[in-house]
């Protein structure tokens, strides 16, 4: 059947619309194009006879169409006029007519549309406002954005007038927003430049900032206002009732106590003619005085006096707090609490209780601190320490000894040789020493305040031969993978080279022995059962040399997986059972036997005489290295079958 | 896209014939007529006439009846001017159009020149 | 046959002026009038027929009007690509071309 396709449907005006025919019938005479329903020669547009190769316009010819051979209509240039249908009326060779109707329809290319408002400032909670979209244009669809999202379903907002005419019953403040209108027709749309709806509102109660109503006399008052408002709020001030200015901060420099009263700022918008006021109670107090530390013992000597701190003045009604090192009072027994806090008492002073302490009083608006005292706690003197530590030295090099003792205030030293006094200094100091020089050096530490001594001997050897060294240890029975062990060569001395050897050998190179302290210490990290070995260290100068006696590393170990021996698993009944059980352990391990889960005996060897097959099971032996508290164990099958079934154990 | 391609530029002398060839490609060729228009050195355009492709019947105004002749090469879709007897006067630029069904020229060849000289 | 009398036969304008171009037939021709561009070296281009439709492509600074025996051509806004020769071409029966205006560029 003869069909006509327009295309496109919907045509927008200056555009081109194709009338595309489908199914024409073949060995035509010629065809034409109407306008209309129906074929009437006053409204034919065009004419065409096949072989013509030429067409003939008709009366409704615009020279905007143009025909093809195939018999569909180009036009072009679309106006409004043209929406309608076009008959085509086929004329085939045998005369006989056939025609089919198609239609399209031409719709505007919209122009930009803009917003007309009935009110451009509304009042909240009190107007409303309709927003029309410009121009009304026939047959198009009206559509609105709010922020660029489409319309909130909300009571207070109506679409009427075809969609065209927006609505906003008793507006807020929120309703300032972005609004956007849009036309729709088949072939366009267009959307407006958006209108910003200027809502008048407020002004809100104001608020007063900041917050705090207390103050300091001497202090600045600055107090500012604020309420939301559109336009923005017109301020005043009244203090006590009384009128001060019109700004939106109120500044009064260096206040008193006759400031205090009552703040009021009040909100005006011109606009909406709307007055809002807030109130604030400002209170002004005196300044308090400055708080000092007072102590009963300036000079506590330690573990032995106690120091009471007061802090001064004082004022009744006050909280009073203290800080040391400026942290708030540590938990102590040592520190006691007045029950007002005024005073704080510290038993028993030690060297680190010095400070700073710091009291402070507090007011309704601050804290007042005082200036930090320090306490001068008497201590010591402790154990004088001299150094160097060398207790060897070589015959003709100047001995130069130290002494040292902490103390408060610091110590006075003297020193005596084999208990002889030699001087009161803190350093001793002898040139070109010979073997004479040998003896007992002690040091003696006074503390005159305390009226404490300590003394510290120490021995020192002058010979060209070094002595024989030892080897000491911090770890005499390690524990293997777990411990490691630090020998150290001694004595110190001067000018001294360290050596150390393992098994007559020099050490060998590995990631767990380190030497350190000029070669005089050797450890060994995370000790090895093989490393159970003779370790000796020697000491050399240039005039002698010597070695220590081996001392061999005990080093603890397992219990290791024990090992159950004979092998066997496989009885005859009546034989002997002798089951032996070892384990590589340092100590020895303790042993025990377990049959079936039953225990047995705490032997290393289990002896069952005479066999029944009532003896299958499993033995199990346990072993435990109580040194290591490390526990190991081992389960092995027992089958016993009658005699003469053995496949092939005899007894 | 359309295209009509002709023969390259004659040199003939007069009482010689020539044959111009105009090639139609991106249309079906039997559904447009084929025109002829002739351009004299430093003259305007002028109609000669047409050739129904459907058909082969031509069509000649007065001033273009005798020595011309239009012809087909339907199955190569290919038009042909022939003029007889060659004079100084048919020295000129040649132009094939297709017409479309309201006869508008609506697609032309490149021109063909023909110089006819003694 | 019809005969197609153009005038001016050559004109010289300023560029962004205008220019009008006429053509005048023996007889009426039922507004069944094409106007073409033609530049050397290449093939005609159709801008306007049956009197005042733009052919697709042609820019609106072309336009055409008229009826009966009398019809006009017009460039608006010249630009230096508009340099060529322009013809009329009546199609009411057979074909007929005008003598042709040459455009110049003052």
């Known amino acids: 059947k003869l069909t006509i396709e327009s295309t496109p449907f919907n045509v927008a005006e200056g555009k081109e619309v194709l009338l595309l025919v489908h199914n024409l019938p073949q060995h035509l005479f010629g065809y034409s194009w109407y306008k209309g329903e129906r074929v009437d020669g006053n409204r034919q547009i065009i004419g065409y006879v096949i072989g013509t190769q030429q067409a003939t316009p008709g009366p409704a010819y615009s020279g905007r169409e143009i025909i093809y051979p195939n018999a569909s209509l180009l036009i072009q240039n679309i106006i409004q006029n043209d929406t309608g249908f076009y008959t085509l009326h086929v004329i085939k060779s045998d005369l006989v007519n056939e025609e089919a109707t198609g239609q399209f329809r031409v719709y505007p290319e919209l122009p930009k549309p803009s917003i007309s408002s009935n009110n451009s400032k509304p009042v909240e909670d009190k107007d409303a406002v309709a927003f029309t979209c410009e121009p009304e244009t026939q047959d198009a669809t009206y559509l609105w954005w709010v922020n660029n999202q489409s319309l909130p379903v909300s009571p207070r907002l109506q679409l009427s007038n075809g969609n065209r005419t927006l609505t906003l019953f008793n507006v807020t403040r929120n309703d300032t927003a972005s609004y956007k209108c849009e036309t729709q027709n088949p072939v366009s749309a267009r959307r407006s430049d958006s209108v910003i709806l200027n809502v008048l509102y407020g002004p809100d109660a104001p608020t007063i900032s900041p917050l705090n109503t207390s103050y300091r006399s001497g202090e600045n008052l600055n107090l500012s206002c604020h309420a939301a408002s559109n336009p923005p709020a017109q301020y005043s001030w009244f203090v006590n009732g009384t009128f001060q200015q019109s700004t939106q901060e109120l500044f009064i420099p260096n206040i008193t106590v006759n400031n205090s009263g009552s703040y009021t700022c009040q909100a005006h918008n011109s606009d909406t003619g709307l007055n809002r006021t807030t109130v604030t109670t400002i209170t002004v107090y005196a300044e308090p005085p400055k708080p000092f530390i007072t102590s009963n013992n300036s000079n506590p000597v330690e573990d032995e006096d106690a120091v009471a701190l007061t802090c001064e003045p004082e004022i009744q009604n006050t909280t009073y707090l203290w800080w040391v090192n400026n942290q708030s009072l540590p938990v102590s027994p040592r520190l006691q609490l007045s029950n007002d806090n005024r005073t704080l008492t510290l038993l028993s002073v030690t060297r680190n209780d010095v400070g700073p302490y710091e009291c402070g009083i507090q007011n309704e608006l601050s804290v007042d601190h005082s200036d930090p005292v320090i306490l001068n706690v008497l201590y010591g003197p402790d154990d004088p320490t001299i150094s160097p530590s060398y207790t060897y030295y070589r015959p003709g090099v100047n001995l130069s000894l130290s002494c040292h003792a902490a103390s408060n205030p610091p110590a006075q030293y003297s020193w005596l040789i084999d208990g002889n006094i030699q001087q009161h200094t803190q350093e001793l100091f002898i040139s070109n020493i010979t073997e004479k020089n040998s003896g007992l050096y002690t040091c003696q530490a006074n503390n005159s305040a305390s009226g404490h001594s300590r003394t510290t001997v120490k021995t020192i050897t002058v010979s060209a031969e070094l002595p024989k060294p030892s080897i000491s240890s911090n770890n005499s029975k390690p524990v293997e993978d777990k411990d490691a062990v630090a020998f150290t060569c001694e004595p110190e001395a001067q000018n001294t080279t360290y050596l150390w050897w393992v098994n007559g050998q020099s050490l060998p190179v590995s990631p767990r022995l380190q030497l350190s302290n000029g070669n005089r210490t050797l450890t060994l990290f995370n000790v090895t059962r093989n490393d159970a070995r003779a370790y000796v260290c020697g000491i050399q100068n240039s005039v002698s040399a010597n070695r220590s006696d081996p001392v061999t590393l005990d080093v603890l170990y397992g219990p290791d997986t024990p090992i159950i021996s004979p092998p066997d698993s496989s009885y005859l009944s009546g034989a002997n059972l002798n089951l032996s059980c070892h384990s590589a352990s340092n100590p020895s391990p303790q042993y025990s036997w377990r049959i079936n889960g039953i225990p047995q005996q705490h032997t290393q060897v289990l002896f069952i005489a005479k066999i029944t097959p009532n003896n299958n099971g499993t033995y199990a032996c346990f072993v435990s290295n109580l040194a290591t508290g490390r526990n190991n164990s081992i389960v092995k099958s027992i089958t016993v079958s009658a005699s003469g079934t053995s496949p092939g154990l005899s007894a | 896209q359309i295209q009509l391609v002709q023969s390259g530029p004659e040199l003939k002398k007069p009482g010689e014939t020539v044959k111009i060839s105009c090639k139609a490609s991106g249309y079906t060729f039997t559904d447009y007529g084929m025109n002829w228009v002739k351009q004299a050195p430093g003259k305007g355009l002028k109609w000669m006439g047409w050739i129904n492709t459907y058909t082969g019947e031509p069509t000649y105004p007065d001033d273009f009846k005798g020595r011309f002749a239009f012809s087909l090469e339907t199955s190569a879709t290919t038009a042909y001017l022939q003029i007889n007897n060659l004079k100084n006067e048919d020295t000129a630029t040649y132009f094939c159009?297709?017409?479309?069904?309201?006869?508008?020229?609506?697609?032309w060849g490149q021109g063909t020149t023909l110089t006819v000289s003694s | 046959d019809i005969q197609m009398t153009q005038s001016p036969s050559s004109l010289s304008a300023s560029l962004g002026g205008k220019v009008t171009i006429t053509c005048k037939a023996s007889q009426d021709i039922n507004k069944y009038i094409s106007w073409y561009q033609h530049k050397p070296g290449k093939g005609p281009r159709l801008l306007i027929h049956?009197?005042?439709t733009l052919q697709s492509g042609i820019p609106s600074r072309f336009s055409g009007s008229g009826s009966g025996r009398d019809y006009s051509f017009s460039i608006s806004n010249l630009e230096p690509e508009d340099i060529a020769t322009y013809y009329c071409?009546?199609?009411?029966?057979?074909?007929?071309f005008g003598g042709g205006t040459k455009l110049e560029i003052k």
């Open positions: 071409l009546q199609y009411d029966y057979l074909r007929t």
């Open positions: 159009s297709r017409g479309d069904l309201l006869v508008r020229l609506d697609n």
């Open positions: 049956y009197t005042s």
